[in-house]
Each structure stands twice: as C-alpha cells, then as structure tokens.
C-alpha cells in the first residue's frame, strides 16, 4: 500500500436547502483506471461512512440509489455534492481516495472539509 496526497477545502457552508458541494483532488502517481471515492464524517472522535462510489476512469461516479451523495469526476478531481443535510449533520467530512487498479494500490485521505449546516428559520404565519 502506498500513500497519496488528497486535497479538499477546509470549510464549506451548506445552502439553505441543505446541499453542500466540494472538490476532492488527488495526486495520482500514475494512470489509474479504477478509483474508489469514499466520504467519511468525523464528529466527536467517531468516524462513519457517508457514501462511497467506485468508478472506472472516463465513466460517471455511481453512488447507490439511496445515497445522499452525487458526484462527477474530471481527471484527478472529484466534485462531490451531499444533499439532505441538517444542522445536526455539521461536522468534518473527509474524502478518501483509493486507486484500486492497476497495481500498486494507493490510499489517500484528505484533512477533511468542515461543513456547516444551518437549518432555515421557519416562515412566520402570514395574516392574509
């Protein structure tokens, strides 16, 4: 297993609709044809998997149907979007990239993107 550098933004603010997007960029040492991208959430020293996708170079990222993530890839960049976020989902979201093929296997883990989610204020009842 060899190490690989992964870069991602330090901070992202989710939209009022609970959507956060960020770019995960990896320094590929060669021409990988099978790449696995995983988003992990770290909060209170606990790590959980948010979503994961394996893609063949040149093809679209495919997350599971019920995933809260979507994404696109371009070269060594992956554009990730996480939907359905609430204030309680605020935390550090870590991008993990694995170059599965061809050998050797490379693993890269980013420093994480702190995603802040603010629940929108409910609309006041109108008097009309």
């Amino acid at each position: 297993c060899k190490a690989m550098h992964v870069a991602q933004p330090a901070v992202v603010l989710a939209s009022s609709r609970g959507i956060a997007s960020f770019v995960c960029e990896y320094a590929s040492p060669g021409k990988a044809t099978e790449v696995r991208v995983t988003v992990l959430r770290q909060a209170d020293s606990q790590v959980t998997e948010v979503c994961a996708a394996t893609y063949m170079m040149g093809n679209e990222l495919t997350f599971l149907d019920d995933s809260i993530c979507t994404g696109t890839s371009s070269g060594n960049q992956v554009n990730l979007t996480i939907q359905g976020l609430r204030a309680m989902d605020t935390g550090l979201y870590i991008c993990k990239v694995e170059l599965m093929y061809p050998p050797p296997y490379y693993l890269g883990i980013g420093n994480g993107t702190q995603i802040y989610v603010i629940d929108p204020e409910p609309c006041p009842d109108s008097d009309f």
């Epitope: 297993c1 044809t33 099978e34 696995r36 992990l40 790590v47 998997e49 994961a52 394996t54 063949m56 870590i94 993990k96 694995e98 599965m100 093929y101 061809p102 296997y105 693993l107 883990i109």
Partner: nanobody
Amino acid sequence: EVQLVESGGGLVQPGGSLRLSCAASGNIFTRNIMGWYRQAPGKQRDLVASITPGGNINYADSVKGRFTISRDGAKNTVYLQMNSLKPEDTAVYYCNAHGSILLNRSNYWGQGTQVTVSS
C-alpha cells in the same frame, strides 16, 4: 471479526486441476482487493492473482493462461481455478484482502491451504 476462510487445497498430479475458495466477511469482500498469494518452502510469499471490487484482474506472469481468479458477490467468495498444474506450483496458498476500512489501512490473511503437485 474479519475472517478469510480458505478451502480446496490438496495433492494433485502434474497437469491436473484444483479450485481454491476463500470466503470473506461481506464488508471486506465488497470494499477490498481480494488476492491469492503463495509461499513455497524457503521462499517469500508472492502474488498469484488479484481482483478488484470493479472486477479488474492482475496475474503473475508464471500463472497467466493457466490460473483464473473470480469473485462471487452473492457468496462473498473469491475463487482460484488452477489448471495445467506443475510441480513448481507446489506451495501454501493464502487468501488476502487489502484496502481500507474507514480511516485505516486493512490487510487480512487467511490461514493458508497446501497445494502439492506431484506424481
């Protein structure tokens, strides 16, 4: 607990065939590169074949055209079909799973199964 359980080894005559199986826990099987390695007495452990979650395959030159690796997602099992066996294929064959789990690298080994090719 992660477990890799191998089976299928044994004694076979030169030119014969064997099929090795390795059953793995589900999470390991779907996320990791599964491989077969072998170790002959007094030698180092060498890669025989590996298969990625996406189905990409890598073979050692010495087994190309004779050995076939495959994976069955429904059974969480990886297979090594070995044909046209030679005496130099005699070794202990180990199943391996490597990749990562959450933030940690993972590298798991089975207990090994003996393959002896002899007349």
